[in-house]
């Protein structure tokens, strides 16, 4: 008996060959006997099976002595064996199909997890095996969990369904839903203008939901809410911000906040959720700021740095086109008495620049200028 | 809802060979038959041959010393070649799904055969 | 192969008219038969198919009937939209083919 696997909600050809090249009559039954369908002459006649309006054949193949009955959007429970009787033979088919689900919903929050459940037909012992985007393999039966799910997990998975030596393959699409960066740092001078940008790692149509950017200012003893917010079909629109700081924030996807200026008491970190609609859960991105101050008071030029720096950076000043007078791994370096010209503050990492800040010492009889 | 995106060089000198592939999104690949048709600037409609997901071909007669249709299952694609082209091969192409009667269809490629 | 010939090539038509096109097979096709429109710049578009079956999301003022070798689409009431190339087609054997077409114009 042939074996045939076929996907739920698929279309499956079940084929029948006669020795003679030719249109002559057949007729496919089920394993109770009902008539599915069959010829009378050149047309296609049909019994009263429930496959009914959902099976066919194809004239054109008559002639060539194939005799095909095609069943459209499978389900499970057209498993069974199919019996086509052609110039007295019978010829026997048996159809299994299997279905393929996800959970609850193919659109999970970074660190959910992802169900697969197996329909299969009475009496089947499948085995399934998926592929992750990101090309790790699991193994199953009747249902596949995959626990805290990763960015890298969007995607297609794979999944095949191992049964008589049989495969069929299903394909899922799995979006995780997450921002595109777990945390990020802007590095400001006192005084700039600040950008956060909260880029999503997906896209859907509609996106609704809410969300809040809590800051806590290394000042600070607690922390506060900044800014909540709304989020309807892709539109932002602000709920309520702080007086101190104003924060602006942008119309339009992807989030954007805008702080006016950067000061040291707004130095910190700040954690952005994002719950959305009909999801159990919150999106987050966390986002430090780090803010660099350098003044002249009287003989001592100070160098300043508020915010979460780990503890590998460098802090440094030096005379512009000159080695660094000092240099520390510390958030706040000086110089006394410094020499007139253009000093530079250096915040680095492993010698790259993240922070500079410029400050101009004036002969002793002037003030200074910071440009 | 099934559709079909199809692509492929729309500019030929004559003896040339046209390619053209067709992907299927959102629908069952397995158990239908996938169709070319082509139809000159002005005129009527012209089937040149099918496929199956399992590689089973028939051609139109006119067109068969030509033509080659091929199946890719795992990118739900398949492809049309015709070899030595001539100006009379002008057409808009079509890649089409079927059991008996041709829906959906391809948006269309018109291939131009000009010296 | 099967020739497929449709009458009239040509015909005018006012909004409201009832249309009546014909196609006649070379030999007998049963009920294989499919017609379809096609509008200008646009692909063909499945109307009627086995003859007389009206195709899923088709408005019912058309209509097929026919066996054979004979066979007739029929628009009860001529709409704006319905101005377009009606083409039938014969699924009885290989290779498939097609009738030159009917144009549709408005009077």
């Known amino acids: 008996k042939k074996v045939v696997l076929g996907k739920k909600g698929d279309t499956v050809e079940l084929t029948c060959t006669a020795s003679q090249k030719k249109s002559i009559q057949f007729h496919w039954k089920n394993s109770n006997q009902i008539k599915i369908l069959g010829n009378q002459g050149s047309f296609l006649t049909k019994g009263p099976s429930k496959l009914n309006d959902r099976a066919d054949s194809r004239r054109s193949l008559w002639d060539q002595g194939n005799f095909p009955l095609i069943i459209k959007n499978l389900k499970i429970e057209d498993s069974d064996t199919y019996i086509c009787e052609v110039e007295d033979q019978k010829e026997e088919v048996q159809l299994l199909v299997f279905g393929l689900t996800a959970n609850s919903d193919t659109h999970l929050l970074q660190g959910q997890s992802l169900t697969l459940t197996l329909e299969s037909p009475p009496g089947s012992s499948p085995s399934v095996q998926c592929r992750s985007p990101r090309g790790k393999n699991i193994q199953g039966g009747k249902t596949l969990s995959v626990s805290q799910l990763e960015l890298q997990d969007s995607g297609t998975w794979t999944c095949t369904v191992l049964q008589n030596q049989k495969k069929v393959e299903f394909k899922i699409d799995i979006v995780v839903l997450a921002f595109q960066k777990a945390s990020s740092i802007v590095y400001k001078k006192e005084g700039e203008q600040v950008e956060f940008s909260f880029p999503l790692a997906f896209t859907v149509e509609k996106l609704t939901g809410s969300g809040e950017l809590w800051w806590q200012a290394e000042r600070a003893s607690s922390s506060k809410s900044w800014i909540t917010f709304d989020l309807k079909n892709k539109e932002v629109s602000v709920k309520r911000v702080t007086q101190d700081p104003k924060l602006q924030m942008g119309k339009k996807l992807p989030l954007h906040l805008t702080l006016p200026q950067a000061l040291p008491q707004y130095a910190g970190s700040g954690n952005l959720t994002l719950a959305l609609e009909a999801k159990t859960g919150k999106l987050h991105q966390e986002v430090n700021l780090v803010v660099m101050r350098a003044t002249q008071l009287q003989k001592n030029l100070t160098c300043e740095v508020w915010g979460p720096t780990s503890p590998k950076l460098m802090l440094s000043l030096k005379l512009e086109n000159k080695e660094a007078k000092v240099s520390k791994r510390e958030k706040a370096v000086w110089v006394l008495n410094p020499e007139a010209g253009m000093w530079q503050c250096l915040l680095s990492d492993s010698g790259q620049v993240l922070l500079e800040s410029n400050i101009k010492v004036l002969p002793t009889w002037s003030t200074p200028v910071q440009p | 809802q099934v559709q079909l995106q199809q692509w492929g060089a729309g500019l030929l000198k004559p003896s040339e060979t046209l390619s053209l592939t067709c992907a299927v999104y959102g629908g069952s690949f397995s158990g239908y038959y996938w169709s070319w048709i082509r139809q000159p600037p002005g005129k009527g409609l012209e089937w040149i041959g099918e496929?199956?997901?399992?590689?089973?071909?028939n051609y139109n007669p006119s067109l068969k010393s030509r033509v080659t249709i091929s199946v890719d299952t795992s990118e739900n694609q398949f492809s049309l070649t015709l070899i030595s082209v001539t100006a009379a091969d002008t057409a808009v192409y079509y890649c089409v799904r079927l059991i008996n009667w041709f829906d959906p269809w391809g948006q269309g490629t018109l291939v131009t055969v000009s010296s | 192969d099967i020739q497929m010939t449709q009458s009239p090539s040509s015909v005018s038509a006012s909004v409201g008219d009832r249309v009546t096109i014909t196609c006649r097979a070379s030999q007998d096709i049963s009920n294989w038969l499919a017609w379809y429109q096609q509008k200008p710049g646009k692909a063909p578009k499945l109307l009627i198919f086995a003859a007389s079956s009206l195709q899923s999301g088709v408005p019912s003022r058309f209509s097929g009937s026919g066996s054979g070798t004979d066979f007739t689409l029929t628009i009860s009431s001529l709409q704006p939209d319905d101005f377009a190339t009606y083409y039938c087609?014969?699924?009885?054997?290989?290779?498939?083919?097609f009738g030159q077409g009917t144009n549709l114009g408005i009077k």
């Open positions: 087609q014969q699924a009885n054997s290989f290779p498939y083919t």
């Open positions: 496929i199956n997901h399992s590689g089973s071909t």
